[in-house]
């Protein structure tokens, strides 16, 4: 799987999950999030050569088309597959609120 | 929506579905499909500027991060959203078989 276990331990040029730390205040200008100060959102990048981790029948066909016709510009793209939530603490007035934001952390990627 | 109705009628540089006709024999080297001879598989391409059809909370955050940090290389990617099946006719020996292949035609795209 093109997941953090594999991708963070290997120098992989092709589609893989990459580490990306986002500081809420510095990178997004968000003052409203109290905790955490930031988090590893991660992101997917890298070419999808040949038939790498094809997601659907379409991406299999497109991957095959691209493999057999290398001059073609239509190739699958490396995007998130498994995502995990992030729990944040913020305040509404003086009232603390704990919220779980879904699909915030990329754990693995696929070619779609 | 970044669908065929919109994208095929507009010169859209950003993420959109693009027409791609695949000839089974010429492009894939498939002799086994009797009908159709090919089909519009289509594909997704184009940049994903901030908030363009963001798919998840992660792609929204990543889009914002990318907008506020233009030097960053981490941006969402334009990939299929809605896919439709394709019905094909082929033969097993002399017996005709009709098969519906799922997720073969891209109808719309998203930034993921």
């Amino acid at each position: 799987a093109l997941d953090t276990n594999y991708c963070f331990r290997n120098l992989e040029e092709n589609c893989c999950v990459r580490p990306l730390y986002i500081d809420f205040r510095q990178d997004l200008g968000w003052k409203w999030v109290h905790e955490p100060k930031g988090y590893y959102a991660n992101f997917c990048s890298g070419p999808c050569p040949y038939l790498r981790s094809a997601d659907t029948t379409h991406s299999t066909v497109l991957g095959l088309y691209n493999t057999l016709n290398p001059e073609a510009s239509a190739s699958p793209c490396c995007v998130p597959q498994d995502l995990e939530p992030l729990t944040i603490l913020y305040y509404v007035g003086r009232t603390p609120k704990v919220e779980q934001l879904s699909n915030m952390v990329v754990k693995s990627c696929k070619c779609s | 929506a970044l669908d065929t109705n919109y994208c095929f009628r507009n010169l859209e540089e950003n993420c959109c579905v693009r027409p791609l006709y695949i000839d089974f024999r010429q492009d894939l080297g498939w002799k086994w499909v009797h009908e159709p001879k090919g089909y519009y598989a289509n594909f997704c391409s184009g940049p994903c500027p901030y908030l363009r059809s963001a798919d998840t909370t992660h792609s929204t955050v990543l889009g914002l991060y990318n907008t506020l940090n233009p030097e960053a290389s981490a941006s969402p990617c334009c990939v299929p959203q809605d896919l439709e099946p394709l019905t094909i006719l082929y033969y097993v020996g002399r017996t005709p078989k009709v098969e519906q292949l799922s997720n073969m035609v891209v109808k719309s795209c998203k930034c993921s």
Partner: nanobody, 114 residues
Framework: QVQLVESGGGLVQPGESLRLSCTAS????????MGWFRQAPGKQRDMVAI??????SYADSVKGRFTISRDNAKNTLALQMNSLKPEDTAVYFC?????????WGPGTQVTVSS
């Protein structure tokens, strides 16, 4: 259900040749492609060569050295590997994609070492 079995792996010296074979059994129809993939320790499984009814494609690293061939009548797939290099060392897998579904063999080890 499709079953695949590879054979022909082994230990060879750099510059030597090997021929891998794969036999497919079961109901073989609607073949998108057949191919050879390889996986080195701790790495992803990567394409070596694929074959459709009348098209072939090779990974850049094996072009001019490896040749894929299919015998549809016998449901077999072969990979002739010449001028082998230490970096070709991997487990080699036969793959058949039928109507969008992947089937894999258990793999055969190829080791190139002096």
């Amino acid at each position: 259900q499709v079953q695949l079995v590879e054979s022909g792996g082994g230990l060879v010296q750099p510059g030597e040749s090997l021929r891998l074979s794969c036999t497919a059994s079961g109901s073989i129809f609607g073949v998108f492609y057949m191919g050879w993939f390889r996986q080195a320790p701790g790495k992803q499984r990567d394409m070596v060569a694929i074959s459709t009814d009348d098209r072939t494609s090779y990974a850049d690293s094996v072009k001019g050295r490896f040749t894929i061939s299919r015998d549809n009548a016998k449901n077999t797939l072969a990979l002739q590997m010449n001028s082998l290099k230490p970096e070709d060392t991997a487990v080699y897998f036969c793959n058949l994609n039928q109507l969008g579904t992947d089937y894999w063999g258990p793999g055969t080890q190829v080791t190139v070492s002096s």
